[in-house]
Amino acid sequence: GNLTVAVVLPLANTSYPWSWARVGPAVELALAQVKARPDLLPGWTVRTVLGSSENALGVCSDTAAPLAAVDLKWEHNPAVFLGPGCVYAAAPVGRFTAHWRVPLLTAGAPALGFGVKDEYALTTRAGPSYAKLGDFVAALHRRLGWERQALMLYAYRPGDEEHCFFLVEGLFMRVRDRLNITVDHLEFAEDDLSHYTRLLRTMPRKGRVIYICSSPDAFRTLMLLALEAGLCGEDYVFFHLDIFGQSLQGGQGPAPRRPWERGDGQDVSARQAFQAAKIITYKDPDNPEYLEFLKQLKHLAYEQFNFTMEDGLVNTIPASFHDGLLLYIQAVTETLAHGGTVTDGENITQRMWNRSFQGVTGYLKIDSSGDRETDFSLWDMDPENGAFRVVLNYNGTSQELVAVSGRKLNWPLGYPPPDIPKCGFDNEDPACNQDHLSTLE
Amino acid sequence: GNLTVAVVLPLANTSYPWSWARVGPAVELALAQVKARPDLLPGWTVRTVLGSSENALGVCSDTAAPLAAVDLKWEHNPAVFLGPGCVYAAAPVGRFTAHWRVPLLTAGAPALGFGVKDEYALTTRAGPSYAKLGDFVAALHRRLGWERQALMLYAYRPGDEEHCFFLVEGLFMRVRDRLNITVDHLEFAEDDLSHYTRLLRTMPRKGRVIYICSSPDAFRTLMLLALEAGLCGEDYVFFHLDIFGQSLQGGQGPAPRRPWERGDGQDVSARQAFQAAKIITYKDPDNPEYLEFLKQLKHLAYEQFNFTMEDGLVNTIPASFHDGLLLYIQAVTETLAHGGTVTDGENITQRMWNRSFQGVTGYLKIDSSGDRETDFSLWDMDPENGAFRVVLNYNGTSQELVAVSGRKLNWPLGYPPPDIPKCGFDNEDPACNQDHLSTLE
């Protein structure tokens, strides 16, 4: 028989983690495996049909994507949809596929809303999701004794699809669910100094443990301004929510692993400011299969898609599409073996959820509502050389924090700063005022 | 030949102005006219196919509506779509129909965004739209000498589809385009007293000419609180943006034409407070055809749809669907006469735009970008008996304000209050400080 996979991803723009130039080769590699393995869909042909989730400007679109999905459904009646990745594109498509009772598989769509499976029925996320970041941060808070207050800042940048809004939304909601904690969240515009200065006025009153989702340059600017305002000492800790590790990568901007460095006149100050900074990223898979997969992926991307794939965490997304597709095909194979059909979306989906799977990204666990458990890394500066390195990993499946041996978190005080200052944010603790008065007697 | 009209409107919930129980009878009456008139589509049959824009709870939905549109397109390949009316339902449908190059005709979708015809190509709005309210308000400001500052308040009520947000958005953007004026806008929650108190603190610093979109009860509450705070004297004017005249209707709530009256202990104060209030509504058509149409509409609604239609401005919406559909059929007839086809959406649409038409709602003008010119009424209190009555009408086609003979706007000072107080909002006018100092010498 024939199994049709309808792809709705950016076909022209290569800059998204889920661009077809990146995911296409991963799909090819997965389908090559299906062909090579007699236990997967024996006697079946799997073919892909493509629709674009971009508008004419190459930007993800909440109109183009569902229109593409409708056209594909109409013409090809696919068994499964692959993508979209962008939140605004995935939302209408996911609601359509739910209505059609056709499975949707993606390694994007990380926003909180997609976890609501009455609205997004049969949507499986084989990639990371922002609520899972909340699981990590909650575990971190428990470990470090921060159970009362946090502050989350997120940048608004025109044309970035509100990435940081959705990231902080997922993080905020899940942390609040997991811990009985006060969390404030504030938005700022990266290209307006007044937004930074207002944040700096607010910080002393609102938090000492601060999460920031922004571009690497904006994070550095904020750290420099915080240093200038005297907010970068031992009392504060700033977590950069840099999930794809952009600031650690080198290239045009920061030096590799030295996210404070730009080769400009502010490097000395920036290095000092970054002593109060830590960086949160997805975890890079460290299994040998992943490295082998990346070699093949890059080769295929260049050969068949004329695309040169850079290194970095962004490649975990095509790898997750690869693993997700294999998991889906495994589920279809089992459904057929039990007398079902490829159009039995509910049955197939149920076989994917609450299941573990060994993929190129390592051990992969899809939870009971169809979302992948996600691993994260926490990076900290080595005070000796200013380079950042992973000091702690979070295993999403076991929900455990695992220290990297021989490395520990670096705290200027020798211990984590309290999440609420000793005397309260506005010196409101009566005991402190009492002390203060007694010294005047 | 056959011409298929695909309807995407609320089929179950009768509370929307564009519910099928209201619009259906209007469509029936229009199609009866087509049958009866030999000059309209001779030899053609017009049929309607129905899709619902509501979700399972009977609420307009940005998922249900485009899904319905897709299903109708698929199964019936219609020549035109009628509806949706709700903003969130109409947005994806309008983008889909633009992509399909199929005309969309509605008397809803009043939000500013639908005026952008590169995105909503072939969308014709035969009903009122919020940007046109801005044309009226700009004309009013010119007439009354308010060319510097205004304040717009809009209520957020869960589940009301952000009606007031969209209304104030259209008003705000168009007034700013038409006049070189500073306009501030603030949102408030109708069910939170702290929001009202914050508004009352803000008003003295932000405006004297104040537009308020809210429920009648919330407007009355705000007026009572303003009176209590001393903000209701001759210095302020409060315009209730009550476009369907809900507060003037009687029934369960206010007495007819006495929007301040509730038969409670606050009526005396409310009447006093409402001396600073004016009400803006759509204009009730006063042509004899409209009254005759309403009689038939109500009869048909009861007979065929088992729905009892109340009186009120809300009936201008089904009437506008009626007129719009006849205008569309006129345009199709002309297109066919010129050798075109019913699928020639561009040509048909061009024949509807920039065109006048005598309908049951009176003289109807569609502007050059496919939006109907809209008439408004301004209501003011008769100080003698406390009843509100129309004192001024706005003709959207001629863009003129037309006073109702024998009636004039009622101003406590005898003239409109200035939009900026004599000494500025914060007494910042140096001349005033000078005066003030001189009295101390």
């Epitope: 307006d192 100094l193 200065t197 207002r198 700096l200 420099l224 400009d264 006149g265 | -």
Partner: antibody
């Protein structure tokens, strides 16, 4: 709308003093840094002084260090430049500029006030 | 202090031409570079910040590029209103410094 209006310029003798003022509207000066930039007629632009958003950092160009003082009055939304020991070579048009250090740089400029130092 | 060197100091071009002005910093300034346009008797107007970002309201015929020490301003199709003096400026480190200017004249 952002506006910066300088005043206080004029003719002064060498060794004399002037106090330039800059009234800002459309934004709060305490949310931004502010700078003074001067331009000798027919010549290029020279930055001479800056103050950061919270007033905690003040910077001067070497060419005028010790002779100028920058200050700000947040309540009046105004910036000032006190200039002492003026020299003929200080004759220039002095612009008040909103300063977004590390973000957008010098984004809004006043039209300038002319200072003429002449005996 | 960081020196900014602009070239050329003057440039003649015709309406419709594409022109490029370069600016070099004496030490690395990453992308903290702005470009200004000044017309006689007027205050400078900010065109570009962060080396390549357009200030709001500036037409897209202006573009900037570069990072570190070498930067360029390009005007894709000259119009009569574009003939003016252009300055680059670094805002990485105080004291801020400007290039000496490039006067763009009609040929």
């Amino acid at each position: 709308e952002v506006q910066l209006v300088e005043s206080g310029g004029g003719v002064v003798r060498p060794g004399g003093s002037l106090r330039l003022s800059c009234a800002a509207s459309g934004f709060n000066v305490d949310d931004y840094g502010m700078s003074w930039v001067r331009q000798i007629p027919g010549k290029g632009l020279e930055w001479i002084s800056g103050i950061n958003w919270n007033g905690g950092r003040i910077y001067y160009a070497d060419s005028m260090k010790g002779r100028i003082t920058i200050s700000r009055d947040n309540a009046k939304n105004s910036l000032y430049l006190q200039m002492n020991s003026l020299r003929a070579e200080d004759t220039a048009l002095y612009h008040c500029v909103r300063d977004q250090w590390l973000v957008r740089g010098l984004d809004y400029w006043g039209q300038g006030t002319l200072v003429t130092v002449s005996s | 202090d960081i020196q900014m060197t602009q070239s050329p100091s003057s440039l003649s071009a015709s309406v419709g031409d594409r022109v490029t002005i370069t600016c070099r910093a004496s030490q690395g300034i990453y992308n903290y570079l702005a470009w200004f346009q000044q017309k006689p008797g007027k205050a400078p107007k900010s065109l570009i910040y962060a080396a390549s970002s357009l200030q709001s309201g500036v037409p897209s015929k202006f573009s900037g590029s570069g990072s570190g020490t070498d930067f360029t301003l390009t005007i894709s199709s000259l119009q009569p209103e574009d003939f003016a003096t252009y300055y680059c400026q670094q805002y990485n480190t105080y004291p801020y410094t400007f290039g000496q200017g490039t006067k763009l004249e009609i040929k």
